[in-house]
Each structure stands twice: as structure tokens, then as C-alpha cells.
Interface confidence: low
């Protein structure tokens, strides 16, 4: 679909409001350190230019690609070299290399201050004074901290953010109305960012084929009544949408996502019976709803898979004729029958099937060779089932905080070279799998747990990639996307690790801990726990538990003291000495 002016085409398709929001997100995701005002100025300039192109598509520069237009605009930033260092070298390149260069400089862990939420009255005043600027700041702050956030979905979050302020700033108790909504948006936003980060990593590190395989499996579970042609069409379109968003082509991505939602709703009769409610919603809500829709019921009387994929004499012929299509059909047929399996497990089964066919179709008697291929699936299915069973039992026994601590110890022993903040963040998120998934019945536990763990372990992988410190992490992250979790699960204590020198400063605490929220206090304690394990990797669970219990009692005691700071100083020294003795440091 060739257009004389791409920028005019997207402006007309998306409308001015969405166009401006998406350009702001794109710029903030590229130049994460730039001040808000600078970005707004750039966005306004691009918007004015787009309007001239809408008026006359033949006007000067209107025929340029969006990458060229946006890249040229970003490269006008005066402080590029001093703020971003070598990223400024991108501006010497031509498209498409320049855009690739900007993408490579996206920072998953930018050095930005923590967002501190102002008082509710302050926020409501700001909202009423200038609603447009207030909402733009939200987009800007989220986008720069999450450079791979799914842009059309961020528009949906912004819409909910606006709705929360519109409703709650008029309420009798503003805080009671607003704060739970903002907490929910924050938590959902972090989860959404992490899920999208995995999609982008899948595309960028493992290629389109890996993403398509994931999509075939997931969509086949979700839409088991849809025929393979339909699932394949959706996979092709979804891959295009995510390739665009992960590549910084946010206008195209949002436009294509809207088209995909439209197609799905127009064809819901041949896709899923669960789409009716979603399809009655406005665009942003509709797209979000479709992405989260529950699995449709499986068609009755699906025949055995063995007939087409094991017993048939044509297996090798069909495989040779169109390998990826045949494997895609296998994945589709297996996934639609197994909503109880995780997507990564389904992909492991498909990989095993592919490996078997590659070997057997070259053998003297192929059928004899692959006849028992389904038997090879049994241990692959049982491994995550057993792991989830054990960990859910541990979670139910310990509760979330202590379960997180058990994982902190486990993962610090596996990969002690990883930075303490990363270990704390990742282990806390791994620990959330308990409350998120263990409540589910057996049939829903595995897809919930293992696919969530894939998202969390990807966080570890992208953070580690920025500053690699552990060969074991690199190996698990890069060898196989679908085997990341089994790879990390299989890691034992790193015997090569040289324990960290003891530093009393690491275990010195002050009265400010008393004013922290429960969550922040937990993080402080968990940070200390990781440091303890790094000092004493051979410490037993019992030793660590004793020290942590003493630590909790020390914090509680000093927070109740009249002279808190003196208590922390004096009791802290005693605690450090006692801990050193208990751990033999």
C-alpha cells in the first residue's frame, strides 16, 4: 500500500491525539535522558510538519520515511554528545543503520531517579491545571523507563490513568479512590512491560521464526476452534505488529494493531466464541481485551494426534514438502489440545519432534525410527509439572516473603556474580509466581507459572546483557529461548565463586528504615540476605534463617526505641558481630 507521504498517511489513520502520543513515546524510548520539555518541543515540530504533509503530500520532505524524519529530528538535539556519549555517533550514519544504532543504545536499566508519587491533592491540582501536560508527562516517564513498552498498550494505560484522575479528583476521599487505582496501573504496567520485553527479545535475539512459533502455540491454545489457516494469518499479522513496535516503528505498529483487532472482530465467528464482549469496546480497550481473552473451549472429538504425526506413512513426505508448515501444524494441533501446557513446553515438544524427524527421515526405516517419538515427550512434560508442584507446596508453607527469600538464596548461590539489586528484583518477581499461579487448579498452573517465569528470567537476561558478569547466565540466556527456565533450574551452587570480602558498611542500618513502606523494608532485608550469601555461599538454610530472624527483631526493636539512631548504631554492631560468629565469617 504505497503512500506518497508516509507521515501524512499515519497522521490521518491515527488522528492527531494518538499521533502526538506515539511520537512522544518513540522519542522518549530512544532519548531516555532528555528533559520532558525538549521532547514536547520535538513532538510539536513533527506534528506541525505532519499537518503540512496532510494538506499537501507533495510538499518538501513529505516523501521521506518516518525513520529519516524522526532520526533527523532526534539528531537536532544539541546536548546529544554530552548526554548520551557514543549514541551521538548514530547521527553520522544513514538509514536504516541510524535507526538500528538508536535501537542498540536503548537502555533497559536507565540511570533515572525513582518515580516518587506526590500527594494526592498535588496530583489533582496538576491534573486540573493542565490535563494535557499531565498526561504527556505520564507517557514520557513510563516510556523512558521502559524503552520497549508496547506503545499502543501504553495509550490504553494513559486512558485509564486519565479516567482515574477524572473520577477520583472529584471524590470525597480522593486518596482512597485514587491510590489503589494507581497501584494497580503501576503493577499492571510493570507486568505489561516485562511481557513485551520478552517478545522483543524473542524477535531480536532468536528471530522471527522463534516468535512465530511462540505465537502459533499461544494463539492455538486461545483459539482452538480456529482452523490452521486462520491461526497462521493471525500469527503473520501479530508478528508484523510486534516487529514494528520492537523496531521503534510505533505509528505503523499502532495502525496495524488496530487493523488486526478490526479483522479479529469481523471474523470472530471463525476465531473464538469468547470475543463478543471485547469486540463491543472502543479501540484501545478492544485491543487490550483481545490480547487477554480467555481460551475458547476445545472442539469436541478432536482425533488423536498420532494418526497424522506418527502413524501416517506420509510423515516424512509431508515434512520434507514444507518443513515449517508441517511443524506449524503439529504445534497448532498439539497446542489446541493442551491449554494445560505452558507455551514453552509446547515449543520444547515441537523441537523434539523436529529433531526426531530430521534424524529419522534420513534413516533406513523412518517409521520404525519415529514410531516412539511421543514417548520422548513424557519426561519433558513431567519436569515442569513436578517443579511447579514442589514450589507451590513450598510457597503454601512459607508465604510470599519467605518464599522469595528461599529463591533469593537459591539464585544467589547459582549466580553470585550478578549484581545484588538485580538478584533482589528478579528473585522477588520469581517469588510472585506463588501468589499468581499456585491458587489455580492443576490444569491452569503450568501455563501460568512457566510462561510467567519465562518473562521474569528474560528480565535477568536483558539486565545481565548490559553488564555481563556470569558465563552461566550468558549460557542459559543465549543457548535456547524455550530452555532458559530448565537451564537455570539445573544450575547448582557455583563452586568457582570466590566469596565477597566482608564489609560492615553493607550491614549498617539507620532509622530511615522505620519510615519505609512494608515493601521497601522487605527489599532492604532481602538486599542484606543476598549480601550475606555472597559473603558465605556455603551457609546453610538454618544459619541464614537464624541471622534473618535476628535482623528482623533488631529492626523491630530499634524502630520502637525512643532514640532510634543510637539504637541502630549500637545494636547494629552487636548484630553484625553475632551474625559473623553464627556464619563463621
Amino acid at each position: 500500500d504505497a503512500h506518497k507521504s508516509e507521515v501524512a498517511h499515519r497522521f490521518k489513520d491515527l488522528g492527531e491525539e494518538n499521533f502526538k502520543a506515539l511520537v512522544l513515546i518513540a522519542f522518549a524510548q530512544y532519548l531516555q535522558q532528555c528533559p520532558f520539555e525538549d521532547h514536547v518541543k520535538l513532538v510539536n515540530e513533527v506534528t506541525e510538519f505532519a499537518k503540512t504533509c496532510v494538506a499537501d503530500e507533495s510538499a518538501e520532505n513529505c516523501d521521506k520515511s518516518l525513520h529519516t524524519l524522526f532520526g533527523d529530528k532526534l539528531c537536532t538535539v544539541a546536548t546529544l554528545r554530552e548526554t548520551y556519549g557514543e549514541m551521538a555517533d548514530c547521527c553520522a550514519k544513514q538509514e536504516p543503520e541510524r535507526n538500528e544504532c538508536f535501537l542498540q543504545h536503548k537502555d533497559d536499566n536507565p540511570n533515572l531517579p525513582r518515580l516518587v508519587r506526590p500527594e494526592v491533592d498535588v496530583m489533582c491540582t496538576a491534573f486540573h491545571d493542565n490535563e494535557e501536560t499531565f498526561l504527556k508527562k505520564y507517557l514520557y516517564e513510563i516510556a523512558r523507563r521502559h524503552p520497549y513498552f508496547y506503545a499502543p498498550e501504553l495509550l490504553f494505560f494513559a486512558k485509564r490513568y486519565k479516567a482515574a484522575f477524572t473520577e477520583c479528583c472529584q471524590a470525597a476521599d480522593k486518596a482512597a479512590c485514587l491510590l489503589p487505582k494507581l497501584d494497580e496501573l503501576r503493577d499492571e504496567g510493570k507486568a505489561s512491560s516485562a511481557k513485551q520485553r520478552l517478545k522483543c527479545a524473542s524477535l531480536q535475539k532468536f528471530g522471527e521464526r522463534a516468535f512465530k512459533a511462540w505465537a502459533v502455540a499461544r494463539l492455538s491454545q486461545r483459539f482452538p476452534k480456529a482452523e490452521f489457516a486462520e491461526v497462521s494469518k493471525l500469527v503473520t499479522d501479530l508478528t508484523k505488529v510486534h516487529t514494528e513496535c520492537c523496531h521503534g516503528d510505533l505509528l505503523e505498529c499502532a495502525d496495524d494493531r488496530a487493523d488486526l483487532a478490526k479483522y479479529i472482530c469481523e471474523n470472530q465467528d471463525s476465531i473464538s466464541s469468547k470475543l463478543k464482549e471485547c469486540c463491543e469496546k472502543p479501540l484501545l480497550e478492544k485491543s487490550h481485551c483481545i490480547a487477554e481473552v480467555e481460551n475458547d473451549e476445545m472442539p469436541a472429538d478432536l482425533p488423536s494426534l498420532a494418526a497424522d504425526f506418527v502413524e501416517s506413512k506420509d510423515v516424512c513426505k509431508n515434512y520434507a514438502e514444507a518443513k515449517d508448515v508441517f511443524l506449524g501444524m503439529f504445534l497448532y494441533e498439539y497446542a489446541r489440545r493442551h491449554p494445560d501446557y505452558s507455551v514453552v513446553l509446547l515449543l520444547r515438544l515441537a523441537k523434539t519432534y523436529e529433531t526426531t524427524l530430521e534424524k529419522c527421515c534420513a534413516a533406513a526405516d523412518p517409521h520404525e525410527c519415529y514410531a516412539k517419538v511421543f514417548d520422548e515427550f513424557k519426561p519433558l512434560v513431567e519436569e515442569p509439572q513436578n517443579l511447579i508442584k514442589q514450589n507451590c507446596e513450598l510457597f503454601e508453607q512459607l508465604g510470599e516473603y519467605k518464599f522469595q527469600n528461599a529463591l533469593l538464596v537459591r539464585y544467589t548461590k547459582k549466580v553470585p556474580q550478578v549484581s545484588t539489586p538485580t538478584l533482589v528484583e528478579v528473585s522477588r518477581n520469581l517469588g510472585k509466581v506463588g501468589s499468581k499461579c499456585c491458587k489455580h487448579p492443576e490444569a491452569k498452573r503450568m501455563p501460568c507459572a512457566e510462561d510467567y517465569l519465562s518473562v521474569v528470567l528474560n528480565q535477568l537476561c536483558v539486565l545481565h546483557e548490559k553488564t555481563p558478569v556470569s558465563d552461566r547466565v550468558t549460557k542459559c540466556c543465549t543457548e535456547s529461548l524455550v530452555n532458559r527456565r530448565p537451564c537455570f533450574s539445573a544450575l547448582e551452587v557455583d563452586e568457582t565463586y570466590v566469596p565477597k570480602e566482608f564489609n560492615a558498611e553493607t550491614f549498617t542500618f539507620h532509622a530511615d528504615i522505620c519510615t519505609l513502606s512494608e515493601k521497601e523494608r522487605q527489599i532492604k532485608k532481602q538486599t542484606a540476605l543476598v549480601e550475606l550469601v555472597k559473603h558465605k555461599p556455603k551457609a546453610t538454610k538454618e544459619q541464614l534463617k537464624a541471622v534473618m530472624d535476628d535482623f528482623a527483631a533488631f529492626v523491630e526493636k530499634c524502630c520502637k526505641a525512643d532514640d532510634k539512631e543510637t539504637c541502630f548504631a549500637e545494636e547494629g554492631k552487636k548484630l553484625v558481630a553475632a551474625s559473623q560468629a553464627a556464619l563463621g565469617l
Epitope: 482452523e227 490452521f228 489457516a229 486462520e230 497462521s232 494469518k233 500469527v235 503473520t236 499479522d237 471474523n267 471463525s270 506420509d314 513426505k317 509431508n318 514438502e321 514444507a322 508448515v325 508441517f326 506449524g328 501444524m329
Partner: nanobody, 124 residues
Framework: EVQLVESGGGVVQPGGSLRLSCAAS????????MGWFRQAPGKEREFVSA????????YYADSVKGRFTISRDNSKNTVYLQMNSLRPEDTALYYC?????????????????WGQGTLVTVSS
């Protein structure tokens, strides 16, 4: 390697009907999206119609909607194009095509296998 053989072409008067058939061999017919394309003398090849593996979806070019019907019989490895209310501008060489990529495609470059074509002439 899939072989496609078209039949059923011929000369017909405006307003008349024809039924084209395309027999496939050498591949697993039920795994392919099947399509019909046509090429008039001195013109580019253009999409006419396509049908999904299990016949759930059918696609038509705007110029033939309501007049042409595509169908398939997987047990016979055959795809059909029923053409009614034929017009002189329908005169062309009609090709049957098979796509192993199972998304919807109206572009000829997405199809992997092609027949030799069958000639349809609409003339009084």
C-alpha cells in the same frame, strides 16, 4: 512437488456460466490454501479468488464478487471455480495456485505452485 492441472475453460457467451476445476497431485492437498488467478492479454496477472484448507474462508476480488464461487473437495484433491454471469472482461487465462503459507494472500508471489492455465473466452 505439487502438480496442478486446470480444466473446464472454453468459449461462452456473455451472461453464460463455466465451472473450472483444478486437480492437485504430489502434495498433501488439505494443507494448502488454494487460489485462482487470471491474466488477460497484455495485462498483469490478477487475483480472482482463494479458499482456506477447510473451506472456512473464501476470498474474492471485487470484480467477481457475487458472480464467482470457489469451493474445494479435499477427498478428491480438487478445487473448483464456478463462474456465473460471465462478462467479456472476464476473458483471460485462468491459473490455479497453491500456497503452503497459510495466511491470506492475494499477491501472486506468495503462491508456491502454479498450473499451466485454462483459457476462458467470453464473446458473442
Amino acid at each position: 512437488e505439487v502438480q496442478l492441472v486446470e480444466s473446464g475453460g472454453g468459449v461462452v457467451q456473455p451472461g453464460g456460466s463455466l465451472r473450472l476445476s483444478c486437480a492437485a497431485s504430489g502434495g498433501t492437498f488439505s494443507t494448502y490454501v488454494m487460489g485462482w488467478f487470471r491474466q488477460a492479454p497484455g495485462k498483469e496477472r490478477e487475483f480472482v479468488s482463494a479458499i482456506s484448507q477447510n473451506s472456512i474462508h473464501t476470498y474474492y476480488a471485487d470484480s467477481v464478487k457475487g458472480r464467482f464461487t470457489i469451493s474445494r473437495d479435499n477427498s478428491k484433491n480438487t478445487v473448483y471455480l464456478q463462474m456465473n454471469s460471465l462478462r467479456p472482461e472476464d476473458t483471460a487465462l485462468y491459473y490455479c495456485a497453491a500456497s503452503r503459507f497459510t495466511s491470506w494472500y492475494t499477491a501472486d508471489y506468495e503462491y508456491d505452485y502454479w498450473g499451466q492455465g485454462t483459457l476462458v473466452t467470453v464473446s458473442s
